[in-house]
Amino acid sequence: ARSEDRYRNPKGSACSRIWQSPRFIARKRGFTVKMHCYMNSASGNVSWLWKQEMDENPQQLKLEKGRMEESQNESLATLTIQGIRFEDNGIYFCQQKCNNTSEVYQGCGTELRVMGFSTLAQLKQRNTLKD
């Protein structure tokens, strides 16, 4: 299979020129997570968008000082979130705006699920909600 096939979005169309990994992260509260975007071209800065499941329109991610950090080299952009919290739950998208064409390319997204049901009662409640 072509490498692009691994990054297809649910509708089946390949995300143009930018590949995001992983597609899903589940970690306990307090852990550090990293998500990556691989680009064909380094001719543009990468920004990060974020949305809750119930949100239709992703918003630009404001990097919380001391807890969130973005880095970018030639073909790789990385978002690091330390000490993850429940409010970090959601889907994160990288977005590259190309310098020469002004075109915007967006990754398929990384879903972050923050876990941390610390008591049996909370686990039971979660299972009840699922049922």
């Epitope: 968008l49 949305k51 809750q52 119930m54 239709e56 918003q59 630009q60 404001k62 409010e87």
Partner: antibody
Framework: QVQLQESGPGLVKPSETLSLTCTVS????????WNWIRQPAGKGLEWIGR???????HYNPSLKSRVTMSIDTSKNQFSLKLSSVTAADTAVYYC????????????WGQGTLVTVSS | SYELTQPPSVSVSPGQTARITCSGD??????AYWYQQKPGQAPVLVIY???ERPSGIPERFSGSSSGTTVTLTISGVQAEDEADYYC???????????FGGGTKLTVL
């Protein structure tokens, strides 16, 4: 230049439903969040809720039980209905467009005063 | 529930610098927006994304952010700057919109 224009009755009786429409001109209604915000006389701004072109809505929790929003992309319009109104709902009602990928408002209607009185 | 807190009023002499603060628990994670509202008019966006200025807004308007507080600064205040100023942001989920109570700027 995008323009927004609110329209609807300026007087509503208590316990009835307030209905307003916002018409968007000189721009597409697609791919934006469209919001309603109100301001009682001499007081601050209060967010009522938003609707996306797909019909997805988010409402202020304090008003959620009384608010319904709808959108008609073919007419470039979106609407607000607020049920069971009281005098406390008397305010200037604004419609506003949310900046794409942000949660602030770049274009506002001029506002329409709605008075709740018998 | 999240709230945004502003001082009710700020007074400043012409030519001086006015600073209006807005504090809220979600501000480290959510961008802030500032609006100017003059009597009988709709609000006008003067600062977005904490510190960016829309085209057409004078350079004397600037914004900054530090932790749970954002600040609107008006340098060299002019008589026409007298108005109500509202900060606005979202809760931590980015879903629900919040407004501060507003600050009346009086130019002495």
């Amino acid at each position: 230049q995008v323009q927004l224009q609110e329209s609807g009755p300026g007087l509503v009786k208590p316990s009835e439903t307030l209905s307003l429409t916002c018409t968007v001109s000189s721009g597409s209604i697609s791919s934006y969040y469209w919001n309603w915000i109100r301001q009682p006389a001499g007081k601050g701004l209060e967010w009522i809720g938003r609707i996306y072109t797909s019909g997805t809505t988010h409402y202020n929790p304090s008003l959620k039980s009384r608010v319904t929003m709808s959108i008609d992309t073919s007419k470039n319009q979106f609407s607000l209905k607020l049920s069971s109104v009281t005098a406390a709902d008397t305010a200037v009602y604004y419609c506003a467009r949310e900046i794409r990928e942000l949660r602030g408002f770049d274009y506002w209607g001029q506002g329409t005063l709605v008075t709740v009185s018998s | 529930s999240y709230e945004l807190t502003q001082p009710p009023s700020v007074s400043v002499s012409p030519g001086q610098t006015a600073r209006i603060t807005c504090s809220g628990d979600a501000l480290p994670r959510q961008y802030a927006y500032w609006y100017q509202q003059k009597p009988g008019q709709a609000p006008v966006l003067v600062i977005y994304k904490d510190s960016e200025r829309p085209s057409g807004i004078p350079e004397r308007f600037s914004g900054s952010s530090s932790g749970t507080t954002v600040t609107l600064t008006i340098s060299g205040v002019q008589a026409e700057d007298e108005a109500d100023y509202y900060c606005q942001s979202a809760d931590r989920t980015g879903i629900y919109v919040l407004f501060g109570g507003g600050t009346k700027l009086t130019v002495l």
